[in-house]
């Protein structure tokens, strides 16, 4: 019994005068804006996006919007076209949604914020944005009170008119409209395709958060990893950092390239490599391989408990006003606008701590 190394778990609520506001990462579920896809992009990535078949032709489709089809037919006329060099990272960067176009209003603790307060980050959804990343020498924002007025409130236009037509099922095209959001510590990178939650247009979504600080014990009392990160890419250990690290190694090993969101110096995958190797390999790793990426729990971690609720926006009463304000049709407002409110429920944090049952 003496060698059993039991532990007990202590739960505590700690009042705080202020809390560090978490990082908030958001991604449009559409990876590439239709208007930004050039003839050269279409030539190189058209098949990956299921916009072209393997003969560089627009597939026979009855699903196409006439206007979009006309534009694509013009772009897909490759007679006498000389392809230029193409780079997936540059394509994601240039054609991904721009926060300056999406962000209609932004307030943090009642003060105006702007697109400048969002840092570009690449994820499996492509070009995404993090508010309060704490990077580039910027301080981490604090909040002094709980409740909706003391957090982040943003209004976004998801720009459905820019969504790529979906003529086939690929990892780069989405059936859904909206954004994916992850609320995370500044000490860990976003892993939004796996850990994010969806926010739909036509709704104001309230996210009430509680900070939870978890303290685990290392072996033999527990199973946490006390060592610092053995990684070329991340400074501090987190399960997310470990998984991204591992997924990168897996892709480089299987495909000799990395996806645009992956760290390191391996070459970026070409569209052909995405289609033939990177997408299926990563899908296999995430869905099927239970052993390749086994990431230990860190001994200290901060997570955010969330409660979501939503109300309709716009109301019948405000539809005309918002349409006029943003110079859009009422239908456009209903299909594209969302409001996201992220705040602490109360100004305290929960500690969940493993303690040795006896010394």
């Amino acid at each position: 019994y003496y060698f059993c190394y039991h532990h007990v778990t202590k739960l505590d609520e700690v009042a705080a005068s202020q809390l560090t506001f978490p990082a908030v990462t958001l991604c449009n579920l559409n990876e590439f804006r239709f208007s930004q896809v050039s003839k050269n992009d279409l030539y190189h990535a058209g098949e990956l996006l299921a916009l072209l078949n393997n003969r560089y032709e627009i597939p026979d489709t009855q699903m196409a919007d006439e206007k979009q089809l006309e534009i694509l037919q013009d772009k897909a006329n490759f007679r006498s076209f000389k392809p230029k060099p193409f780079n997936m990272r540059e394509f994601y960067d240039r054609a991904g949604h721009d926060i300056r176009d999406m962000l209609l209003s932004c307030h943090f603790r009642g003060e105006a914020c702007s697109a400048e307060d969002f840092k570009v980050v690449f994820t499996r959804y492509g070009k995404c944005y993090t508010f309060n990343s704490g990077q580039d020498g910027r301080p981490r924002l604090k909040t002094m009170k709980g409740g909706t007025g003391n957090g982040l409130e943003i209004m976004l236009d998801i720009q459905q008119d820019e969504y790529l037509p979906v003529w086939g099922e690929t990892d780069e095209t989405s059936f859904e409209a909206g954004i994916k959001v992850q609320i995370h510590s500044q000490d860990e990178p976003p892993f939004i395709d796996q850990l994010g939650f969806g926010v739909a247009p036509g709704f104001q979504t309230f996210v009430s958060c509680q900070e939870q600080r978890l303290i685990y014990l290392p072996s033999p009392w527990g199973t946490c990893n006390a060592v610092t990160m053995d990684s070329d890419f991340f400074d501090s250990y987190s399960i997310t950092a470990c998984r991204i690290d591992c997924e990168t190694r897996y892709l480089v090993e299987n495909c000799n390239c990395r996806m645009v969101h992956m760290p390191g110096d391996a070459p970026y995958c070409t569209p052909e490599q995405y289609k033939e190797c990177a997408d299926p390999a990563l899908d296999f790793l995430v869905e099927k391989d239970q052993e390749y990426c086994v990431c230990e729990m860190p001994c200290n971690l901060t997570r955010y408990g969330k409660e979501l609720s939503m109300v309709k926006i716009p109301s019948k009463a405000s539809a005309k006003y918002l349409a006029k304000k943003f110079n859009k049709s009422e239908q456009y407002i209903g299909e594209n606008i969302l409001v996201l409110d992220i705040f602490f429920e109360v100004l305290n944090y929960e500690t969940i701590e493993q303690k040795k049952a006896y010394e």
Epitope: Y250, N254, P280, D283, F284, K288, D289, Q290, E291, Y292
Partner: antibody, heavy 116, light 107 residues
């Protein structure tokens, strides 16, 4: 180049034993699950057994459970299939394969004949 | 275990024909299905993985489609080299299972 080379087949009497080996090269062997697949003469393909990258998890088809043991030595980049209590219906070409998002490559196939 | 039902078991066709072979899983396997071509005395050759991805070096006349439980291998224009036996395989979960095979023969 990724390669698998199987060996150890041959003729064995019913109730006898045989150990097949599959030597891997060109990839990080310990990172990948591996499987054995067989094909009886004139018949279709049948999955026999699988093993995780570390060797910690093993899986078997009902037809060989309790008689066959899959194992691996990651230091030698080699996969094994220990076949005991062999029966006439185990006569087949045996292939080793690397499991991943696509099963490639397959070994060249090794003939096992169980006959008295 | 997941059963894989392949049809037809034999298919007679001529050079230039368009042919399809279907494979049905007894439960959903997402897109984790592969198609192989096998010629007598040879190891199976991978044609399609993850339901619709053409393996490198495989002619574009081969294509795969489907997800969930129903899958199809299509050869758009049969060539003399295509007469062989074709197998589907699910690799969604152990025990991995193969279809019983479709023998494609010259009419």
């Amino acid at each position: 180049e990724v390669q698998l080379l199987a060996s150890g087949g041959g003729l064995v009497q019913p109730g006898g034993s045989l150990r097949l080996s599959c030597a891997a090269s060109g990839f990080t062997f310990s990172s990948f699950a591996m499987s054995w697949v067989r094909q009886a003469p004139g018949k279709g393909l049948e999955w026999v057994s699988g093993i995780s990258g570390s060797g910690g998890s093993t899986y078997y088809a009902d037809s060989v459970k309790g008689r066959f043991t899959i194992s691996r030595d990651n230091s030698k980049n080699t996969l094994y299939l220990q076949m005991n209590s062999l029966r006439a219906e185990d006569t087949a070409a045996y292939y080793c394969a690397k499991e991943a998002y696509k099963w490639q490559p397959w070994g060249q196939g090794i003939r096992v004949t169980v006959s008295s | 275990d997941i059963q894989m039902t392949q049809s037809p078991s034999t298919l007679s066709a001529s050079v230039g024909d368009r042919v399809s072979i279907t494979c049905r899983a007894s439960q959903s396997i997402s897109s984790w299905l592969a198609w192989y071509q096998q010629k007598p005395g040879k190891a199976p050759k991978l044609l399609i993985y993850k339901a619709s991805n053409l393996d490198s070096g495989v002619p574009s006349r081969f294509s795969g489609s489907g997800s969930g439980t129903d899958f199809t291998l299509t050869i758009s224009s049969l060539q003399p080299d295509d007469f062989a036996t074709y197998y589907c395989q699910q690799y969604n979960s152990y025990s991995y299972t193969f279809g019983q095979g479709t023998k494609l023969e010259i009419k």
